[in-house]
């Protein structure tokens, strides 16, 4: 449905407030180093222009595409070359190449200072003094640090952020009210960003077909009562939404997401019995709620899958007529019966089924050839089940911090070339799978754990892609999206790695560690552990555990000492010497 002016169309659909917020997010995600004030100025200029187009869609330049309008605006930034270097070359290109060029320069790990939370009174004053600027700053700071954050969802986070300040800045104990809410938003925000990053990587690195397969599996688990045609329609619409957001088309994305939520709520009866509460909420909450809704109950008495997909004589005929539709139906039928499987496992099973049909439908006796295809699924199902059982056992034995340490050692031995901050960040996140998923009953453990691990390993993949240092990481990240986790799990010690030279400075600690938060102190110790393994990759777990126990005791002792700095200096030297002896250095 063509509009004379795309910018006017989106302005009218979204309303001024959402329009401005989404343009700010888009600009901050593209130009991640630009100061806040510069972005606000650009957004105001675009908004004023949009208003002229709303008034008269035939006005000059109103017929231009959003990419042209936004790209032209970004290219007016005076310091583009000094700040962004070769990204400035994008401005010499024409659309759509210019937008593709901007997308390629998005930085998953921008060199930006850590966001430090001011005192509660300072934040409340800023909030009251200028609420609009305060909330815009939130959008800007999150968007520039998370250039693939799902924009319509960021509007929902901003709404909750505003509600937290509105409520808590009037409370008797502002800090007790506000800080837990901000912590929750921060943690949920990081998780949301990482989940969306995987969707964008799936689309951009593996294509629309890969994303659609993921969506068929996930939506079929969530809406097992829905017909295949209904699930297919939802998948098509959802793919459009995420393709737009991942491509920087945030206005279209937000608009289409709203349309999809509207459609789902108008057709609840044929989709899921679990949507009622979601559909009573306002737009942003509604969309979020639908995205997180629990799986509906499976229809009773679903027939065996074997009848249509193994026993039928028409398997090859049906497959040949419309391969992707037939495979989509297989995936739908399997997924709706298995909410207890991870999406990536379901996709592995579908891939195995596809490979078998490709081979067997060309054989002399196809039916005889594919008759045992379901037997091939058993080891694929058992592999993640075993892995989760083992790791949950270890998590329950160790607790989160020590479980993270076990993963740090494991991944450093597998891919020691990866930077220490990346190994620490990724392993800490991998370790959170324990608290997140091991508490669940068996039927919910695998979808929780393996699909979460896919999100975390994608963080490793995107960070590594920026500065590739390990062929093994590149291989596991690029060969198959659904086999990333099994690929990393199967890696043994990298025998080609030359151990890092010992550097005393790396293992020198000071009294400042005593004033750090528990989390920051853990990160310091985990950084030292990674460096230790890089220095001594053949050290056994028992050896490393002994060194880490000594290290924890050393920090505790020196933080209790009267002269902390002297203690760290003297005891630190002894610890390094003892550790070198223990590890046979």
């Amino acid at each position: 449905d063509a509009h004379k002016s795309e910018v006017a169309h989106r302005f009218k659909d979204l309303g001024e407030e959402n329009f401005k917020a989404l343009v700010l997010i888009a600009f901050a995600q593209y130009l991640q180093q630009c100061p806040f004030e510069d972005h606000v100025k650009l957004v105001n200029e675009v908004t004023e222009f949009a208003k002229t187009c709303v008034a008269d869609e035939s006005a000059e330049n109103c017929d231009k595409s959003l990419h042209t309008l936004f790209g032209d605006k970004l290219c007016t930034v005076a310091t583009l070359r000094e700040t962004y270097g070769e990204m400035a070359d994008c401005c010499a290109k024409q659309e759509p190449e210019r937008n593709e060029c901007f997308l390629q320069h998005k930085d998953d790990n921008p060199n930006l200072p850590r966001l430090v939370r001011p005192e509660v009174d300072v934040m409340c004053t800023a909030f009251h003094d200028n609420e609009e600027t305060f909330l815009k700053k939130y959008l800007y700071e999150i968007a520039r640090r998370h250039p693939y954050f799902y924009a319509p969802e960021l509007l929902f986070f901003a709404k909750r952020y505003k509600a937290a300040f509105t409520e808590c800045c009037q409370a008797a104990d502002k800090a007790a009210c506000l800080l837990p809410k901000l912590d929750e938003l921060r943690d949920e925000g990081k998780a949301s960003s990482a989940k969306q990053r995987l969707k964008c990587a799936s689309l951009q690195k593996f294509g629309e077909r890969a994303f659609k397969a993921w969506a068929v599996a996930r939506l079929s688990q969530r809406f097992p009562k829905a017909e295949f045609a209904e699930v297919s329609k939802l998948v098509t619409d959802l793919t459009k939404v995420h393709t737009e957001c991942c491509h920087g088309d945030l206005l279209e994305c937000a608009d289409d997401r709203a349309d999809l939520a509207k459609y789902i709520c108008e057709n609840q009866d044929s989709i899921s019995s679990k949507l009622k509460e979601c559909c009573e909420k306002p737009l942003l909450e509604k969309s979020h709620c639908i995205a997180e809704v629990e799986n509906d109950e499976m229809p009773a008495d679903l027939p065996s899958l074997a009848a249509d997909f193994v026993e039928s004589k028409d398997v090859c005929k049906n497959y040949a007529e419309a391969k992707d539709v037939f495979l989509g139906m297989f995936l739908y039928e399997y997924a709706r019966r298995h909410p207890d499987y991870s999406v990536v496992l379901l996709l592995r099973l579908a891939k195995t089924y596809e490979t078998t049909l490709e081979k067997c439908c060309a054989a002399a006796d196809p039916h005889e050839c594919y008759a045992k295809v379901f037997d091939e699924f058993k080891p694929l199902v058992e592999e993640p089940q075993n892995l989760i059982k083992q790791n949950c056992e270890l998590f329950e034995q160790l607790g989160e911090y020590k479980f993270q340490n076990a993963l740090l050692v494991r991944y450093t031995k597998k891919v020691p070339q990866v930077s220490t901050p990346t190994l620490v960040e990724v392993s800490r996140n991998l370790g959170k799978v324990g608290s997140k998923c091991c508490k669940h009953p068996e039927a919910k453990r695998m979808p929780c754990a393996e699909d979460y691990l896919s999100v975390v390993l994608n963080q490793l993949c995107v960070l590594h892609e920026k500065t590739p240092v390990s062929d093994r990481v590149t291989k596991c990240c690029t060969e198959s999206l659904v086999n990333r986790r099994p690929c990393f799990s199967a890696l043994e010690v990298d025998e080609t790695y030359v151990p890092k030279e010992f550097n005393a400075e790396t293992f020198t600690f000071h009294a400042d560690i005593c004033t750090l938060s528990e989390k920051e102190r853990q990160i310091k110790k985990q950084t030292a552990l990674v460096e230790l393994v890089k220095h001594k990759p053949k050290a056994t777990k028992e050896q490393l555990k002994a060194v880490m126990d000594d290290f924890a005791a050393f920090v505790e002792k020196c933080c209790k000492a009267d002269d902390k700095e002297t203690c760290f200096a003297e005891e630190g030297k002894k610890l390094v010497a003892a550790s070198q002896a223990a590890l046979g250095l």
Partner: nanobody, 124 residues
């Protein structure tokens, strides 16, 4: 330290059986998981089977499932690998390993202590 010594290897015909033993000394055996790995001639070392510290969880490579059985006797500080329906492709040096986590992982680097190995040859 834990010392591990494998025994029970030898030459056997296809379809035959062997029982490998792994005797442990030095530390409390019951706090360790035990794994069996093998290295076929000219190939990488590969996982065969593992059993956790208490003996209630066992894991097998797909290639040996249904043919091999891992077990342990903590009172005797010994682990076992019962191998039946042996095939020529089972020919390898078999190693016993101990894992201080007590889990019984699939990856060889998770194991702290290793035996020297015992040769198993399946040939007619």
């Amino acid at each position: 330290q834990v010392q591990l010594v494998e025994s029970g290897g030898g030459l056997v015909q296809p379809g035959g059986s062997l029982r490998l033993s792994c005797a442990a000394s030095g530390r409390i055996f019951s706090t360790y998981a035990m794994g069996w790995f093998r290295q076929p001639p000219g190939k990488e070392r590969e996982f065969v089977a593992s059993i956790n510290r208490s003996g209630d969880s066992t894991y097998y490579a797909d290639s040996v499932k249904g043919r091999f059985t891992i077990s342990r006797d903590n009172a005797k500080n010994t682990g076992y690998l019962q191998m039946s329906s042996l095939k020529p492709e089972d020919t390898a040096v078999y190693y016993c390993a101990a894992d201080s986590d007590g889990i019984g992982w699939f990856n060889s680097f998770e194991y702290d202590y290793w035996g020297r190995g015992t040769q198993v040859t399946v040939s007619s």
